[in-house]
């Protein structure tokens, strides 16, 4: 029996099948079993990382350091690769065994935590065919997927999907916003066989839909029928001139007239001053510019609409989705701050298996970390307030000593002198 | 929106120099790349070389390689373009042109087109 | 290095659809944006990534790339659509326009 066969076995799932003309194509089939981890990446044997990751060869890139950062939830589990030098490009990788996901889920989880409140910066991970030469991985290096958050000044503060489909890099025509907080937080993208894709954040979906409708992948289902154009004699004025009208006989005043109430100054010369004119006022009986009143077009026919056609150079395609082949992992960006940690990555068919792991791995920690970056917080503003009260403690001081400088030289004489002295004058 | 404002014609004499200055307001300097295009009379339109100035790298066309250099200065929101050794076949208007960044990576102005330009700047190179 | 290829001039009737076109080997791959230039002004954006309108480009402008033509349609062209058109896309970070196409529109 041919493998689908013993796929489908049970009662009758083939007649099922046919009763219901349930279209399905053998690449699009795929059961369930064992989750498939193609990779899987913690940072959790110390230097270890350091043979699995390839450094692009050149001097001036950003090094990563391995690092749980300045606060975290758990201090070796939240070691993760942390880009270490301002104004750097970085380029590092890591291989796995090449697989292909026709027919089956792609999941890519990764955490990302920019605890350095990061101005301009990626956050991103793009997923490369294993033909990648890891040692030369730059910003024209073709990839398969890129996916994760970008933060570059005020304008963009994005989760970039980005899939290359027949050599183009294609983006996603919706907006959607990554974290920009300090703190860890876990993306998550799932590529399914039916042509669907989700984001998730944090565990919980943020967007998803269908691949043809929110990348321009295919080119348009309809366009404009090139062979019509708009007929002489449509008529898109919905009003026009009252015909019938027409500009009264008194309706052309000058707009300014001279001021009747004005006298010529008694101490005017005119051979000094030349010939008297009055001011100009505004002419209140001034209509303006005569408009005909405006009635409906009898000839209107509304805005005339291009007919659209059926696109000759449409043609669906069912494997958008997939790719044959994916080998590496890399991080390639741009970063104007440095301080960003990147963790807990996973490639898998698997959707739960992802969630799980998220919740795992970042699920248990993220409390922790904030736990201690308030801590944190609160006693750098303790600190703060303890400095402020100092430098306002020692200003008072300074203030004291200048007046005393300031004030004239008085005899020095004891209290106790003092006193005697208003005693007795008293 | 950003506006991009050029500074003006120049002649200059072969075998000199010139600097043309592209001063932008109204938007993010750092949210934008800066290109140069120049366009001789009667020419079509020419790529010299480009900028990201929160980067601070420019990347230049094979042709103008070691001839020009194009810098930015972000505390002015100027971009700046020198070209060096001029001859009279390089009489023509010079465009400044902005494209969204729309992400930290410096191909990022790729996907976008150069949305903005100036207003142009005749250079007229002749002894 | 990377050519891109237009026809030097396109006419057209007023209200007809225009088509320029513009060849390069897999152009599909690219990113494909068309800029109107007018004489004695800078060049305007009006199609980005093969066929999106910047803000404010009329509708009648749109764009398609496959294959190894890109091409911009101007549908129910008007007189005031009389200008030069180009090509431009991204090869290797390096910037590449075609060398243009100055649309007629007759009559």
């Known amino acids: 029996s041919s493998s689908l066969e013993v796929l489908f076995q049970g009662p009758g799932l083939n007649d099922i099948f046919e009763a219901q003309k349930i279209e399905w194509h053998e690449e699009n089939l795929y059961f369930q079993g064992e989750p498939a981890v193609y990779f899987k990446e913690q940072f959790l044997d110390g230097d270890g990382w350091t043979s699995r990751w390839i450094e692009k060869h050149k001097s001036d890139f950003g090094k990563f350091v391995l690092s749980s950062g300045k606060f975290y939830g758990d201090e070796e589990k939240d070691k993760g690769l942390q880009t270490s030098q301002d104004a750097r490009f970085y380029a590092l990788s890591a291989s796995f065994e090449p697989f292909s996901n026709k027919g089956q889920t792609l999941v890519v989880q990764f955490t990302v935590k920019h605890e350095q409140n990061i101005d301009c910066g990626g956050g991103y991970v793009k997923l490369f065919p294993n033909s990648l030469d890891q040692t030369d991985m730059h910003g024209d290096s073709e990839y398969n997927i890129m996916f994760g958050p970008d933060i570059c000044g005020p304008g963009t503060k994005k989760v970039h999907v980005i899939f290359n489909y027949k050599g183009k890099n294609v983006l996603i025509n919706k907006d959607i916003r990554c974290k920009d907080d300090e703190f860890t937080h876990l993306y998550t993208l799932i590529v399914r066989p039916d042509n669907t894709y989700e984001v998730k954040i944090d565990n919980s979906q943020v967007e998803s839909g269908s691949l043809e409708d929110d990348w321009d992948f295919l080119p348009p289902k309809k366009i404009k029928d090139p062979d019509a154009s708009k007929p002489e004699d449509w008529d898109e004025r919905a009003k026009i001139d009252d015909p019938t009208d027409s500009k009264p006989e008194d309706w052309d005043k000058p707009e300014h007239i001279p001021d009747p109430d004005a006298k010529k100054p008694e101490d005017w010369d005119e051979e000094m001053d030349g010939e008297w004119e009055p001011p100009v006022i505004q002419n209140p009986e001034y209509k303006g510019e005569w408009k005909p009143r405006q009635i409906d077009n009898p000839d209107y026919k509304g805005t005339w609409i291009h007919p659209e056609i059926d696109n000759p150079e449409y043609s669906p395609d069912p494997s958008i989705y997939a790719y044959d082949n994916f080998g590496v992992l890399g991080l390639d960006l741009w970063q104007v701050k440095s301080g960003t940690i990147f963790d807990n990555f996973l490639i898998t068919n698997d959707e739960a298996y992802a969630e799980e792991f998220g919740n795992e791995t970042w699920g248990v920690t993220k409390a922790a970390e904030k736990q201690m970056k308030d801590k944190q917080d609160e006693e750098q503003r303790t600190r703060r307030m303890m400095r402020t009260k100092m430098r306002m403690r020692r200003m008072r001081r300074t203030r004291r000593k200048m007046r005393r400088k300031m004030s004239p030289a008085r005899p020095r004489t004891s209290c106790r002198e003092a006193c005697l002295q208003g005693w007795t004058e008293a | 929106e950003v506006q991009l404002v050029q500074s003006g014609a120049e002649v200059k004499k072969p075998g000199a120099s010139v600097k043309v200055s592209c001063k932008a307001s109204g938007g993010t300097f750092s949210s934008y790349a800066i290109s140069w295009v120049r366009q001789a009379p009667g020419q079509g339109l020419e790529w010299m070389g480009g900028?990201?100035?929160?980067?601070?790298?420019?990347n230049y066309a094979q042709k103008f390689q070691g001839r020009v250099t194009i810098t930015a200065d972000e505390s002015t929101s100027t971009a700046y373009m020198e070209l060096s050794s001029l001859r009279s076949e390089d009489t023509a208007v010079y465009y400044c042109?902005?494209?969204?960044?729309?992400?930290?990576?410096?191909?990022?102005?790729?996907?976008?087109?150069?949305?903005?330009w100036g207003q142009g700047t005749t250079v007229t190179v002749s002894s | 290095s990377y050519e891109l290829t237009q026809p030097p001039s396109v006419s057209v009737a007023p209200g007809k659809t225009a088509r320029v076109t513009c060849g390069g080997n897999n152009i599909r791959a690219k990113h494909v944006h068309w800029y109107q230039q007018k004489p004695g002004q800078s060049p305007v954006l009006v199609i980005y990534?093969?066929?999106k309108r910047p803000s404010g480009i009329p509708e009648r402008f749109s764009g398609s790339n496959s294959g190894n033509t890109a091409t911009l349609t101007i549908s129910g062209t008007q007189a005031m659509d009389e200008a030069d058109y180009y090509c431009?896309?991204?090869?290797?970070?390096?910037?590449?326009f075609g060398g243009g196409t100055k649309l007629t529109v007759l009559g």
């Open positions: 990534q093969d066929s």
């Open positions: 900028i990201i100035p929160i980067f601070g790298t420019a």
């Open positions: 431009q896309a991204w090869d290797s970070s390096t910037v590449v």
């Open positions: 042109a902005s494209s969204p960044l729309r992400g930290s990576g410096w191909y990022w102005h790729y996907y976008y087109g150069m949305d903005v």
